[in-house]
């Protein structure tokens, strides 16, 4: 029988007293087959999150700070619930750490150094820790004592909590810098009368401060928010604008073996009898013998955390830099504005061998990081353990709801000034064999499909998508008969035609023969009756263009495209016969490596892009036999975004709202991820 | 297919050198660029170093100011000076040369270097 207790760990003993009251009356409402609590005491959070590393219990709930502490090794926990506060139909589980200015200051963030700063408090999230943590490597050295340093990076502050004799300047604009709400100062709403005030020039506080602290839009509209990319933006754009992302509170497991499945049900159990407003006799969010035991006082209830996310993606990217730089204290030497390499993420053992001579080439410009899928990559991007890599749109969208950026984007066409002119976008089409002269759009029921990868745009989001419109469900594995679909789930039928050997099978990269633009078409010629490919997929692969054995032969008259009127046209014909418009491929990367990325990609496409003429003895960035490896074959340039610099505006509102409406089909455990930290 | 074959290998002591050689059968080597990769047990395979054909070199961190690459075209040989070797130095080393364009699975036999006391 399989054990279903979950061991709760306590810090004291008003705690250990609620946990034990908690046991009971869970054991009163749940069947004797379903999850129970158990308690156990330990004398602080480290030792709680010890013991659940040591398997001696199983969860506790951390503020942020400790959610860090947890996911550091040896611990290796993650987050598996969150609380959320705010009501069930609006669920908050972050709140935003943010700077807030006066409109007419005129300074951007790189600019803070000399300014007055008001606090919330010494050793507090928003108001300190995050601030301080990603200003850290601007400090002035030694930045041992922080405070010390903080004091003579700014003019004046007030730091409530801060030791006044030491570090008058940290009590300048708060004489006394006394650590209650005596300080008028102090906290979140003190933070801000400090600015309001005019006492200080910046206030480091959370997005709720403002709003609850002016009930007037006029009177918020004087006030601004310091972006990380130095811009500013106005106060409820915090979204886009802040400086860290900060869960409220979490509970974590163990990473292994970490039961989350049967946390989850204990607590989702445990909210439907205990939560807000349910049960007299046990209330799960309220605390008569002390504050916030076991679960915050003021949450409304539980949240799922999406089993992808990991701690790193959950704390997101900016709040670990912080409490990276304050705990280790370690910058880099001498900060410059020369751009540190580009860690470029490559898929599989194919693109890894591009990107190596590439980042041989590049005399160190450019690194190589390697993932098995694109969503990995993705995510090593998001948390900084690569930098940037060039994606289908489909991805692009991916990117986008996890904060990334595009930056540059792949061009198809010769034209002279290339760089200047990012295009249209290129057609998705559906290819088939001419010799199957009954095929057509409205017959492909029962027939053999062939994908690029799923969540790509040709292969997948755009035939997909048209198809959920007529079949209104996401069974697309039911209504073809087989497929290679690669990124599906291996025992699917649209893993069936697939030609990747043992582990290979189906996966979304280069081992699996069926891969890609390439690939899918691959599939068609060997074993289906349609492919969702791009318009340049034929002509690239026959008349001897393609050496490879399965194509060398191939004429480019023997295949058709299915049009949406559910006629048939030759291949040359795709700007009449087509499935839609897809958007180029893009460079992403993270915003606060954008400019780099910008700068250093168009240095090395002057170098090695489509002006090199002999690719049999030079490195040319844009070629790889076919085989679209790092960036699609026929690139001719990577181009300037102007305008179009987020996803949104990238791919267009009709493609993203294409890709929106599949989202109901998603498997994608990143886009949950993703979600889940901004919905 | 250009035929590799790594020489050179051997056991020796931390902080000694060994200079690992790297002999291409094929017109291609004068104009290709080049690399040393190593593939340590239950580890990775991995850039150690690469020359361009210009002669520009490259090396992953671990390993600059210790590790030299080089070339003699005219002998179609490529070269791994490794000086004050570690520990963590010990793997198969294997030399490619990219001519066939990254999605090959061909790698030669490589030769062994074992650094230990």
């Known amino acids: 029988v399989p054990d279903k207790t979950v061991r709760w760990c306590a810090v004291s003993e008003h705690e250990a007293t609620k946990c034990q009251s908690f046991r009971d009356h869970m054991k009163s409402v749940i069947p004797s087959d379903g999850p129970s609590v158990a308690c156990v005491k330990k004398a602080s959070y480290l030792d709680c999150i010890r013991a659940i590393a040591a398997n001696e219990a199983d969860a506790v709930t951390l503020d942020a700070g400790l959610v860090y502490d947890a996911y550091l090794a040896p611990n290796n926990l993650k987050p598996v619930v969150a609380e959320f506060y705010g009501s069930k139909e609006d669920p908050q589980t972050f709140y935003y750490a943010v700077a807030v200015v006066k409109k007419d200051s005129g300074f951007q963030m790189n600019q803070l150094r000399g300014k007055k700063s008001c606090h919330t408090g010494l050793g507090r999230s928003a108001g300190w820790n995050i601030p301080i943590g990603l200003l850290y490597c601007d400090l002035p050295e030694p930045r041992k004592p922080l405070e010390k340093a903080v004091a003579n990076f700014f003019s004046g502050s007030c730091a409530p909590c801060a030791d006044g004799t030491d570090f008058p300047q940290l009590c300048q604009l708060c004489p006394g810098c006394g650590c209650s709400t005596l300080n008028q100062y102090f906290g979140y709403s003190g933070a801000f009368k400090c600015l309001k005030d005019g006492a200080g020039d910046v206030a480091f506080v959370k997005h709720s401060t403002i709003f609850e602290n002016l009930a007037n839009k006029a009177d918020r509209d004087q006030y601004e928010l310091l972006c990380l990319d130095n811009t500013r933006k106005p106060v409820d754009e915090y979204k886009d604008c802040h400086l860290a992302q900060v869960p409220s509170h979490t509970v974590v497991a163990r990473s292994m073996g970490g039961k989350e499945d049967l946390i989850w049900e204990l607590l989702n159990q445990a909210q439907e009898h205990f939560g807000k407003d349910k049960s007299k006799e046990f209330q799960l969010f309220s605390s008569p013998h002390g504050k916030d035991l076991l679960f915050k006082d003021s949450a409304h209830g539980f949240l799922k955390v999406p089993p992808r996310m990991d701690a790193k993606m959950y704390l997101g990217y900016e709040y670990v830099t912080a409490i990276r730089n304050l705990r280790e204290g370690t910058c880099p030497e001498a900060p410059t504005d020369e751009c540190k390499p580009v860690k470029w993420c490559a898929l599989s053992h194919h693109e890894r061998l591009k990107c190596d001579e590439w980042s041989v080439n590049s005399v160190g410009k450019i690194e190589c990081v390697s993932a098995e899928t694109t969503e990995d990559c993705i995510a090593k991007i998001m948390n900084g353990e690569a930098d940037a890599m060039s994606l289908d749109g489909g991805f692009v969208y991916i990117a986008g709801k996890c904060g990334l950026v595009p930056v540059l984007a792949e061009n198809y066409n010769k034209s002279d000034n290339c760089e200047d002119t990012p295009e249209a976008g290129y057609f998705a089409i559906a290819v088939v064999k001419k010799s199957a002269s009954d095929l057509t759009w409205d017959n492909l029921k029962g027939k053999k499909s062939c994908h690029t990868a799923v969540g790509r745009t040709a292969g997948w989001n755009i035939p997909m998508g048209l198809l959920y419109n007529k079949i209104n469900h996401c069974r697309f594995d039911e209504f073809f008969s087989e497929g290679c679909a690669p990124g599906s789930k291996k025992d699917s039928s649209l893993c069936k035609l697939c030609m990747g050997s043992g582990l290979n099978l189906c996966e979304p990269n280069n081992k699996e023969g069926y891969y890609g633009y390439t690939g899918a078409f691959r599939c068609l010629v060997e074993k289906g009756d349609v492919a969702f490919v791009k318009h340049q997929t034929v002509p690239q692969n026959t008349g001897g263009k393609n050496p490879d054995p399965w194509a060398k032969n191939l004429n480019e008259k023997d295949y058709e495209l299915l049009c949406l009127d559910g006629t048939r046209k030759p291949v040359e014909e795709y700007a009449n016969c087509h499935l839609a418009r897809a958007p180029n491929h893009a460079v992403v990367t993270r915003k606060d490596k954008e400019a780099c990325v910008h700068k250093i990609l168009r240095q090395q496409q002057h170098l090695f892009g489509s002006n090199v003429t002999d690719c049999s003895g030079n490195f040319c960035l844009f070629r790889s036999e076919t085989k679209d490896l790092l960036f699609r074959d026929d690139t001719v340039c990577l181009a300037k975004l102007h305008d179009r610099n987020t996803y949104e505006k990238y791919l267009g509102e009709e493609y993203v709202k294409a890709v929106g409406n599949l989202r109901k089909c998603s498997t994608s455990s990143l886009l949950e991820a993703c979600t889940f930290r901004r919905p | 297919q250009v035929q590799l074959v790594e020489s050179g290998g051997g056991l020796v002591q931390p902080g000694g050198s060994l200079r690992l050689s790297c002999a291409a059968s094929g017109s291609i080597f004068s104009i290709a660029t080049m690399a040393w990769y190593r593939q340590a047990p239950g580890k990775q395979r991995e850039l150690v170093a690469g020359i361009t054909r210009s002669g520009s070199t490259n090396y992953r961190d671990s390993v600059k100011g210790r590790f030299t690459i080089s070339r003699d075209n005219a002998k179609n040989t490529m070269y791994l000076q490794m000086n004050s070797l570690k520990p963590e130095d010990t793997a198969v080393y294997y030399c490619?040369?990219?001519?066939?364009?990254?999605?090959?699975?061909?790698w030669g036999q490589g030769t062994q270097v074992t650094v230990s006391s």
């Open positions: 490619t040369d990219y001519s066939s364009r990254y999605y090959h699975d061909y």
